[in-house]
Amino acid sequence: GWVWNQFFVPEEMNTTSHHVGRLRSDLDNGNNSFQYKLLGAGAGSTFIIDERTGDIYAIEKLDREERSLYILRAQVIDITTGRAVEPESEFVIKVSDINDNEPKFLDEPYEAIVPEMSPEGTLVIQVTASDADDPSSGNNARLLYSLLQGQPYFSVEPTTGVIRISSKMDRELQDEYWVIIQAKDMIGQPGALSGTTSVLIKLSDVNDNKPIFKESLYRLTVSESAPTGTSIGTIMAYDNDIGENAEMDYSIEEDDSQTFDIITNHETQEGIVILKKKVNFEHQNHYGIRAKVKNHHVDEQLMKYHTEASTTFIKIQVEDVDEPPLFLLPYYIFEIFEETPQGSFVGVVSATDPDNRKSPIRYSITRSKVFNIDDNGTITTTNSLDREISAWYNLSITATEKYNIEQISSIPVYVQVLNINDHAPEFSQYYESYVCENAGSGQVIQTISAVDRDESIEEHHFYFNLSVEDTNSSSFTIIDNQDNTAVILTNRTGFNLQEEPIFYISILIADNGIPSLTSTNTLTIHVCDCDDSGSTQTCQYQELMLSMGFKTE
């Protein structure tokens, strides 16, 4: 049978030929009749065999980290017969380890994030070094970790490479630390090889700072002309934390007048003071409010850092603005009777300067030839008024400060012209009537109506009569219909075109005004030559009108 011990060859041997061991057949009596052969990967290139003795040699430097074992085949042949003395057999050559590899941190770079103020013992990160040497060969790959840089804040567990916090850290003082870890093989014994790595440890923020106003007093100004919603200034608190932990909310703690509000600009973390109600310099020219600030997000366990909110005082000065005159009323309505003489009193408007200096006011009327206004605001007429021409006047009255003519206010003034009974009633139209020669008595010649340009206080009522002369001539008569109309009727039978071709009737129309006014209106009546049926060529139009006539008893 085959005889051999386990074969080992140390790595990194520099000799040209290193004796690994010997394999032989127990049938070999040493008379050089046997030939030994080596087969397989590495045979002849990495390992050779002395064909006579079976001694095996490594002929090149080996690297255990590259390859730690070789499986070769051995043959032994009897030279005299050419036959195999033993069956072909496999054997293993192991490459034994030397400590020729330092520990390496293959997962570099290392970076860790840990919350500030983390308690002692908090795990930060684990670093792991690899040693290419054989872990089963002594202590060549047994590592010990130590801290070269990072005390007193960090520590490393010697056998695991776990980095822990050993002292609380405040991000606001220092937000990152470089820790240097060394790994030594041979468990740190003499002759050990080492490798180092750097670990960047960043502290993440916790909300351990409340926002604080740097200024205890802010002075702001607001114009009295500023509309509600106007931003009148900003206030700013500072929080040493970052990100969400530095987000803050501003609010008003004291504002008796409830005139101001504070909103938060979450992008700039500023507080914006807003005008909630309009201010009036003449009413109140300064305000004092107190604002407070607190973080937007506060965890329950961090409330101890946020017990009392920071506050600041804000003094707000109201700036006076030269305001235009202010009329007592938004508009005025005055009344005046028509036909009153020029210079008649219409009414008084009044405006004042709302500012403290109380400038005198001058008044004017825009584009009016009918009215005048004096410096006291008294409006008078410049002409007699006729309601029947204009019943209303829309005036624009302007008040101007004497000391600043740019300060102007205008208001509308409405003047109603009141009616007096200064117009008698008259025909509502021109009447021209016709009567046939053969007309009978009581025949309706014309229906008349009247109009009055005066305004009716209640309702117009007109009274119709013939003049005294016409009443006496008695060719025609009039009947008042009591509805502001009247009818003219014939008062005789038969008319003569040749003798009296035209009649002029004077009709008196009186109104019910006080005093009553009467007008005389002339009605022209033409006599026509009519046939028996009451129609004639020259009276065709009249025929139609007369055919509608009626007789009265």
Epitope: G40, D63, E66, R67, R73, L106, A132
Partner: antibody, heavy 120, light 108 residues
Framework: QVQLQESGPGLVKPSQTLSLTCTVS??????????WSWIRQHPGKGLEWIGY???????YYNPSLKSRVTISVDTSKNQFSLKLSSVTAADTAVYYC????????????WGQGTLVTVSS | EIVLTQFPGTLSLSPGERATLSCRAS???????LAWYQQKPGQAPRLLIY???SRATGIPDRFSGSGSGTDFTLTISRLEPEDFAVYYC?????????FGGGTKLEIK
């Protein structure tokens, strides 16, 4: 787990040099016990080992290609590369990179392969 | 160099059947140095067996390997539809490292 990815031009002109790179992810190329290998497969044919390299730079080549092959390693980039010079149409193949167990010689894992065509 | 010959070149079987694939070496190869791979169309080879008989990680137990010296066998005890592919053997016992020509396992 370790993954490999081949990259390089898909078309090379005859007589020029074919250059491919294999990028290793999920593990360091600098770990002992492994070779980093190139294998090729002609269209519709079997597999042919080209050669391999240890991360420290030692190389082993198939004698049939040795005169034209160079394999190199860049540990800083976790990459190894193949250069095959004086290519002909016979070098048209799918080229794979793979990790080889240095003690027992099996290939695992493999890249997905890249087809290189040699044509003018 | 060691030449690996695989037979049959093509094997036609049905799902559920047993498949036996052979690999013969031109010289003796240590069983530690023989591996089997599976390759599907358009994919890279996948390691099935190493050391002649050890299953690689994630390989179902219907795959088994055996053999020594010059004759090695890959057995698939009960074929699944996904097992139809090309199978290669590979040796590391002598330089250059070589692959067999492959056996195509197809659905009957």
């Amino acid at each position: 787990q370790v993954q490999l990815q081949e990259s390089g031009p898909g078309l090379v002109k005859p007589s020029q040099t074919l250059s491919l790179t294999c990028t290793v992810s999920g593990g360091s190329i600098s770990r002992g016990g492994y070779y980093w290998s190139w294998i090729r497969q002609h269209p519709g044919k079997g597999l042919e080992w080209i050669g391999y390299i240890f991360y420290r730079g030692r190389t082993y080549y198939n004698p049939s290609l040795k005169s034209r092959v160079t394999i190199s390693v860049d540990t800083s980039k976790n990459q190894f590369s193949l250069k095959l010079s004086s290519v002909t149409a016979a070098d048209t193949a799918v080229y794979y990179c793979a990790r080889v167990n240095s003690n027992y010689g099996w290939f695992d894992p493999w890249g997905q392969g890249t087809l290189v065509t040699v044509s003018s | 160099e060691i030449v690996l010959t695989q037979f049959p070149g093509t094997l036609s079987l049905s799902p559920g059947e047993r498949a036996t694939l052979s690999c013969r070496a031109s010289q003796s190869v240590s069983s530690s140095y023989l591996a089997w791979y599976q390759q599907k169309p358009g994919q890279a080879p996948r390691l099935l067996i190493y050391g002649a008989s050890s299953r690689a990680t994630g390989i179902p137990d219907r795959f088994s390997g055996s053999g020594s010296g010059t004759d090695f066998t890959l057995t698939i005890s009960r074929l699944e539809p996904e097992d139809f592919a090309v199978y290669y053997c590979q040796q590391y016992g002598s330089s250059p490292l070589t692959f067999g020509g492959g056996t195509k396992l197809e659905i009957k």
